[in-house]
């Protein structure tokens, strides 16, 4: 059998006066009791109605009643001021039963045909209530055949009486330092049969203050204290209330950080409730006085628990706790009314004594030893032998505590050695090898390490030499014994330098010609520049104009002399540059392989011979005077030549340095 509701048997039918449609007799009394199933009512209407009309229907009438209530007393054919005929009206029972009584008196002045009526049971819509009557349900009413049910809005639950909606108003916890809470639906009437609990729970150290605001309306009683609805306030110290009636309760200073508010309502009444605005206070901390040259933010009238302030220093002043710097400072007020950190100082920024400048000096401009904010210092390089690299040397103590140049640089200026200074101011005539005098070739470097070789000082920590001269030591740089500042090869008086690394041109192939015969040695320490130790300049772009054929260059070294021994004293020779084609042709004949002279080489010497560099001079510089700058520069590096030095028709071959400027600059900048 299919499941589902069991519908009641249908209730419907017809009623009529005795003898209908004929006239009814006198002295008739007839009663019908109609009953519908629970949850249903009866509907009745007349299709015919013709009864004797009398004042207030005293003689003949049809009376409709439901329970104890008379719904209508009907007579006549049409309604008058004092009598009612049914006309087209429909009549409804109040519950599930309807009584119909027909009565005729002892006489009729004329014949009356009585009535005919039809009835039927129909569902009662319990959700429809007459104006002024209490609604069936608190919130939502749902009608169905034979009955109804109630439901509630979100935040409410249906009471066990199945009609009232009780508010779900417990368990709310307020943790902010201030806020508002109110009875449910405020300012509309609060719900019935509800028990609400609100908690204010602040951090220890705070004290809650309650203010009742706007209006207060809670059901009361003239004699008994709040017997129906009431509001109570509980703290860990005491209970306040109960409160009811229409008077706003006074402010409550709870002196507690936790408060429980209870609101209980009964099943009746129509009252708007209450609203509380709560705030909190705490023991204030001492008012923060800003240190000199500082200010407090934010500025408040008072600072209580969890309030904080920060200190900001004026430009040029910094936060210090004693000697220790702080980037920022924020103090927080604690529950005992003390700050969690002591006040720092705003001290004038002190950049401290400026760093020493290698090969230079510093001068205090603002005042002797003044190193505070906006103080000015002036760096300068040791005159004659050093010059300052792209910097005017003026530094200011800035607010960040660093000495800063006019270009915003915080690093020290660089004192670069002046290059190409020599006691010789011009190239000499072509004459035999000469002994060098002090300061003639201050760039000259003596390299010992297996063999004797030479090099030229670049800057104050690099040596330019020939690749073949240091090839054997490329993996053991520390084996190189580097000497400078002396004329005598065997003198004990010299400046010692040691190699940190050897860089051989990647295009150089040992024992396969001398192309790319160039190397750089990085010294492990800077050397002090003076009149006997000065770097050689690298050629400018325009340098080739001083290195044309027949222009005079100067080679220097301790290499083999005409006697066949290494020179004891530094020697030099002035030699002209030889036409490149002429030099190439000179080395095309055996025993020299074709292509010995490349575009990376330049040749110098006399066709007649006798003036040349020789073994032991390898790696030394062939230098030229730049007449525009009046500085000497390296044009060539002693590389190779004929088996017999100074041989007629043969020339000394030198690495052409101008071809290697990018390589030299890259190595020096990278390392």
């Amino acid at each position: 059998t299919p499941l589902g509701p069991k519908w009641p048997e249908p209730v419907f039918g017809r009623l009529a006066s005795p003898g209908f449609p004929g006239e009814y007799a006198n002295d008739q009394e007839r009663r019908w009791t109609l009953t519908a199933p629970p949850g249903y009512r009866l509907r009745l209407y007349f299709t015919h109605f013709d009864l004797e009309l009398s004042h207030l229907c005293e003689y003949d009438f049809v009376k409709l009643s439901s329970g104890a209530k008379v719904l209508a007393t009907l007579c006549g054919q049409e309604s008058t001021d004092t009598e009612r005929a049914p006309g087209k009206d429909t009549f409804y029972s109040l519950g599930s039963s309807l009584d119909i009584t027909f009565r005729s008196d002892y006489s009729n002045e004329k014949p009356f045909t009585g009535f005919e009526a039809f009835y039927a049971a129909e569902d009662i819509d319990e959700c429809q209530v007459a104006p002024g009557e209490a609604p069936t349900c608190d919130h939502h009413c749902h009608n169905h055949l034979g009955g109804f049910y109630c439901s509630c809005r979100a935040g409410y639950v249906l009471h066990r009486n199945k009609r009232t909606c009780s508010a779900l108003c417990s368990g709310q916890v307020f943790t902010q330092r201030s806020g508002e809470l109110s009875s449910p639906e405020y300012p509309r009437p609060y719900p019935k049969l509800s028990s609400c609990t609100y908690s204010i729970s602040l951090e220890e150290g705070f004290s809650v203050i309650l203010d009742f605001v706007e209006s207060f309306d809670v059901e009361t009683h003239p004699e008994t204290l709040c017997p129906y609805d009431f509001l109570k306030i509980q703290t860990d110290r005491e209970e306040h209330g109960p409160f009811c009636g229409k008077t706003l309760p006074h402010r409550i200073e709870t002196k507690s950080n936790t408060v429980t508010i209870t609101f209980v309502t009964d099943e009746s009444g129509d009252h708007t409730g209450w609203k509380i605005h709560y705030t909190s206070t705490a023991q204030p901390c001492p008012y923060p006085m800003a240190p000199p040259n500082g200010h407090v933010s934010p500025v408040q009238a008072k600072y209580i628990l969890k309030d904080s302030f920060s200190i900001f220093c004026e430009t040029g002043y910094e936060l210090l706790q004693g000697h220790l710097p702080l980037k920022s400072f924020t103090a927080v007020c604690q529950k005992d009314g003390s700050w969690d950190r002591p006040m720092p100082a705003c001290s004038i920024v002190d950049c401290g004594p400026p760093d020493d400048l290698p090969s230079g000096r510093v001068e205090y401009i603002t005042g002797p030893g003044v190193t505070t904010y906006k103080a000015v210092i002036q760096y300068s390089c040791e005159e004659t032998f050093y010059t300052m690299k792209v910097n005017d040397g003026k530094y200011v103590c800035e607010a960040d505590g660093f000495w800063t140049s006019s270009k915003g640089e915080k690093s020290l200026p660089v004192c670069e050695p002046v290059c190409g200074l020599s006691a010789r101011t011009t190239g000499g005539q072509i004459y035999g090898g000469q002994k060098a005098k002090p300061g003639d070739f201050p760039w000259q470097v003596l390299i010992l390490g297996g063999t004797t070789a030479a090099g030229a000082l670049l800057y104050d920590n690099w040596v330019l030499t020939a690749a073949h001269a240091v090839y054997e030591q490329k993996h053991d740089a520390s084996a190189l014994d580097i000497r400078m500042g002396t004329l005598k090869r065997l003198s004990p008086h010299y400046t010692q330098a040691w190699s940190e690394a050897v860089f051989i041109h990647e295009g150089y192939t040992h024992d396969a010609g001398f192309d790319n015969d160039i190397a750089l040695i990085k010294l492990n320490n800077k050397v002090v520049i003076n009149s006997n130790i000065t770097p050689i300049c690298l050629p400018r772009k325009e340098a080739e104009s001083f290195m044309r054929t027949d222009d005079i260059g100067t080679a220097s070294g301790w290499g083999l002399t005409q006697r066949g021994f290494l020179a004891r004293n530094l020697m030099y020779v002035d030699i002209p540059i030889v036409d490149h084609q002429k030099c190439t042709a000179a080395y095309e004949k055996p025993p020299y392989p074709r292509g010995s002279v490349t575009a990376n080489m330049l040749c110098a010497g006399l066709e007649s011979g006798g003036k040349d560099s020789c073994r032991g001079d390898s790696g030394g510089a062939l230098v030229f005077l730049d007449s525009e700058t009046e500085r000497w520069f390296v044009g060539g590096i002693v590389s190779w030549g004929s088996m017999n030095c100074g041989e007629a028709g043969q020339y000394g071959v030198y690495t052409k340095v101008i071809n290697y400027i990018p390589w030299i600059e890259n190595i020096i900048s990278d390392f």
Epitope: Q321, G322, H323, L324, P325, K327, R341, G401, F402
Partner: antibody
Amino acid sequence: QVQLQESGPGLVKPSETLSLTCTVSGYSITSDYAWNWIRQPPGKKLEWMGYISYSGRTSYNPSLKSRITISRDTSKNQFSLKLSSVTAADTAVYYCSRHYGDYWGQGTLVTVSS
Amino acid sequence: EIVMTQSPATLSVSPGERATLSCKASQNVGTNVAWYQQKPGQSPRALIYSASYRYSGIPARFSGSGSGTEFTLTISSLQSEDFAVYFCHQYQSNPLTFGGGTKVEIK
């Protein structure tokens, strides 16, 4: 959780340079504070060597000024100590710490000996 | 430099008793003083900064006081874990300096 950890060789030869690094986790060394190097020779009291601040400024103990360098590598959140020309008197447990000592490394013993 | 002198060098106290440690600065250091506890083989542990401010996590039995040149660290009721060496430290001026330490031992 702020943590500091010293690292570096435990043995250094006389006249060489002592190098130590302090790696900081849980806090950026550029955010705030001074970052110190402090040492404690065996059986002796603590000695402050110097600091590098959040901004990169340094302050050194005058007794060490000619030999000490404190630097930092912000990309690695590290600061370093270099002490040149060491002698046996530089043998100590070396600590790095923050500001006025709220956080310390566990310390590393450096012995100066040939 | 500012010299920090601690006294006594050794303090013998029974557990549960009060210990008072003194530190004197050779010059005015304001309240720029910190106190540390150090146990053998361990790095120092910060207790107090700015003379009287206790670091979070440090038990309330430790308290600091003083300003100018005289400072005190008080341990109200010594626990077994409190037996250690205690250092004071001034950070008022360069060079920052430490006291020689007070060893608190069990009586």
